[in-house]
């Protein structure tokens, strides 16, 4: 008699990434009987919530419920109804909410309260909303990419699942760039992690990992831009800021109140004789790069070596996956190819930034002007951060892999977060059974 397949025995999980600039909902799926196996969880859906990050709802908290509706309804459609009550939902808020909490714990709590109340109305198993730490964000990003790359699996494969996958069990480092913070996480080579705050110990699938991580708050691409503007306006002779990080011919009016709204610009705050100023782009990569370097304090280091601002950074080791805005920006600039050297990237950035704004708008007519205008800054910032901030060199640049997805799942902290909260990464290596008999009768 022919074997008949039983109904698919699968589980689902939902994670909302409440970032500083937007919120994304991810739906994950895995075979129920293989929960402890490595690499079985995969992303089946990403839904980007329309609108800004949740921290921007402080003055319009009543709109949070509507804001989340479309993506939560999408989750209701994607996940079979019979599974709704068993499907956990987690919301993790990152640096945008960390900054709001720094300004006012009460306001941050109010936003999270309304977020939780709104999400609890859906038929899922809502497990709460919380602001994750920068250390968690780094750690879960590292877990995600290494889980998806099969680095925790004891079985070495004779084939490669992704183009840049090396066939050994050495883990990839993780480089994550958001709007308000950036994380660097990797396993250093036989190096003591000199600052306890940056040290993580994991036991995953029977193997111990000593991991370095740091999250630089205010050094995400959006907050770094606010920092740069606040720094540069200090020395402007009038309300015109000639800015090398924007294309020639670009003009934009900025409110001083908006500039000083974020805690990230507090160190540059001063009384200005105007309420508004105008950015006038001059499109010069080299000058832009120099201006960005002034955001990194490299004059002080209490350790054997530092990244910047006195933060310990061990010597870089192995390959790195650079994801989130590292990927989105470089993808837009067409610079994600493994074959593009650091020198070539720099050359292309010089050309891109020098292009007139009118020309750029014509070439990229479908792109929102707000985003389009900032690619010169963002690309330059990525180079500055990786080279001067984290000490990558022209040689080690080839060890950076700009990653959007791995086997269909987005690179980012959300998968690692869910794997941890659902206890799907065992400390010990599970006993492998030759065959699972649960699928066929």
């Amino acid at each position: 008699t022919q074997n008949k397949a039983l109904p698919e025995n699968v589980k689902y999980g939902i994670v909302l990434d409440a970032g500083s600039s937007h919120t994304s909902l991810y739906i994950y799926k895995w075979p129920a009987e293989k929960e402890n196996d490595t690499g079985v969880v995969h992303q089946v859906e990403e839904c980007r919530v329309k609108g800004p990050g949740i921290s921007k709802f402080v003055q319009k908290v009543n709109e949070i419920g509507i804001y989340l509706t479309d993506c939560m309804e999408r989750a209701r459609e994607v996940i079979p109804r019979s599974q709704h009550q068993e499907t956990p939902v987690y919301l993790g808020a990152t640096a945008g909410m960390r900054l709001l909490r720094m300004e006012s714990e009460e306001l941050a709590d109010r936003v999270l309260d309304v977020v939780e109340r709104s999400l609890s109305n859906y038929p899922f198993d809502f497990q709460g909303a919380r602001i994750i730490t920068g250390q968690e964000e780094g750690a879960y990003g590292w877990i995600t990419i290494n889980y998806l790359l099969g680095k925790f699996s004891q079985k070495t494969r004779w084939f490669s699942i992704v183009p840049y996958e090396t066939n050994n069990q050495e883990t990839f480092g993780a480089l994550d760039l958001g709007g308000a913070s950036t994380q660097v996480t990797f396993v250093p080579q036989n190096q003591t992690i000199e600052s306890p705050d940056n040290a993580l110990q994991f036991r995953l699938y029977g193997k111990d990992y000593n991991v370095y991580t740091h999250s630089f708050l205010c050094y995400g691409k959006d907050q770094a831009l606010w920092q740069k503007l606040a720094k540069d306006i200090q020395v402007a002779s009038n309300e015109i800021l000639r800015d090398p990080c924007f294309h020639p011919g670009y003009k934009k009016v900025v409110n001083v109140s908006d500039l000083y709204k974020t805690p990230c610009t507090k160190r540059f705050e001063m009384t200005l004789p105007f309420q508004q100023f105008e950015i006038q782009g001059i499109g010069n990569y080299q000058q832009c790069h120099q201006s960005i370097l002034e955001l990194f304090n490299t004059s002080y280091c209490p350790y054997s070596q530092c990244a910047f601002n006195g933060i310990f950074l061990p010597p870089l080791q192995g390959d790195f996956g650079a994801f989130s805005a590292f990927y989105f920006v470089m993808k837009f600039l067409n610079l994600t190819s493994e074959k593009v050297s650091q020198e070539k990237v720099t050359e292309m950035m010089k050309k891109f930034c020098a292009q007139p704004w009118e020309e750029i708008k014509t070439s990229y007519a479908g792109v929102k002007e707000k985003y389009l205008s900032e690619y010169c800054f963002s690309g330059t910032y990525i180079l500055s951060l990786l080279l001067q901030g984290y000490h990558f060199t022209a040689d080690s640049w080839e060890h950076i892999h700009f990653i959007g997805k791995i086997q269909g799942s987005d690179a980012g902290w959300t998968l690692g977060y869910m794997l941890n909260l659902t206890n799907m990464i065992p400390a010990e290596q599970p006993l492998s059974t030759p065959l699972s008999h649960s699928t066929y009768v």
Epitope: V61, N62, I64, G65, E106, D109, R110, L112, D113, V114, E116, R117, S118, S120, F126, Q127, G128
Partner: antibody, heavy 119, light 107 residues
Framework: QVQLVQSGAEVKKPGSSVKVSCKAS????????IGWVRQAPGQGLEWMGG????????NYAQKFQGRVTITADESTSTAYMELSSLRSEDTAVYYC????????????WGQGTMVTVSS | EIVLTQSPATLSLSPGERATLSCRAS??????LAWYQQKPGQAPRLLIY???NRATGIPARFSGSGSGTDFTLTISSLEPEDFAVYYC?????????FGGGTKVEIK
């Protein structure tokens, strides 16, 4: 000192609806949340739902979703709980209670409203 | 949802004795657990919040402890007015849930 004063007892027929009010006095109403909890005769306490009047954000226990509506009127500092399609099992004392901040308990309670559902 | 299990269901004690009431959660509620006292015909009254903090006006004989999944309410020396039903409630996750109650009665 904040006080919550609820409307009087009600007797209702099965299939009908009941609307219980909860008026706050002596303190800020809008920024706090108001929760609704019921207690059937001789039974324990059961959370039904809640609202933050300032934002109109309401949430409900899955058991009551589609049958309960919680609203608030900031101008009169009053919260309302309407339960429809009443059945005999809905006979209970309905309490409103203040829930001042995120993840806080119910620190101030109304006196309760007895709702009897009988044909 | 989080299930709270209270034990014992009934506690028969004499005035002056120590009462120990237990509340166990089906998953961690961190320290977001409250205790209420309810007397016949009255609304519940908040005694303890965040596991161990006494609410305003609550006598020092009432104390709470625990975190995660196991919590205890202790009444160090029972007064005649303490004989009532006690409920625990978690405010960590929605929906808010209550334990089934422990009745403290006079022996």
């Amino acid at each position: 000192q904040v006080q919550l004063v609820q409307s009087g007892a009600e007797v209702k027929k099965p299939g009908s609806s009941v609307k219980v009010s909860c008026k706050a006095s002596g303190g800020t109403f809008s920024s706090n949340a108001i929760g609704w909890v019921r207690q059937a005769p001789g039974q324990g306490l059961e959370w039904m739902g809640g609202i933050i009047p300032a934002f109109g954000t309401a949430n409900y226990a899955q058991k009551f979703q589609g049958r309960v509506t919680i609203t608030a009127d900031e101008s009169t500092s009053t919260a309302y709980m309407e339960l429809s399609s009443l059945r005999s099992e809905d006979t209970a004392v309905y309490y409103c209670a203040r829930d001042p901040v995120r993840r806080s308990p119910f620190d101030i309670w109304g006196q309760g409203t007895m709702v009897t559902v009988s044909s | 949802e989080i299930v709270l299990t209270q034990s014992p269901a009934t506690l028969s004690l004499s005035p002056g004795e120590r009462a120990t009431l237990s509340c166990r959660a089906s998953q961690s509620v961190s320290s977001y657990l409250a205790w209420y006292q309810q007397k016949p015909g009255q609304a519940p009254r908040l005694l303890i919040y965040d596991s161990s903090n006494r609410a305003t006006g609550i006598p020092a004989r009432f104390s709470g402890s625990g975190s995660g999944t196991d919590f205890t309410l202790t009444i160090s020396s029972l007064e005649p007015e303490d004989f009532a039903v006690y409920y625990c409630q978690q405010s960590f996750l929605w929906p808010r849930t209550f334990g089934g109650g422990t009745k403290v009665e006079i022996k």
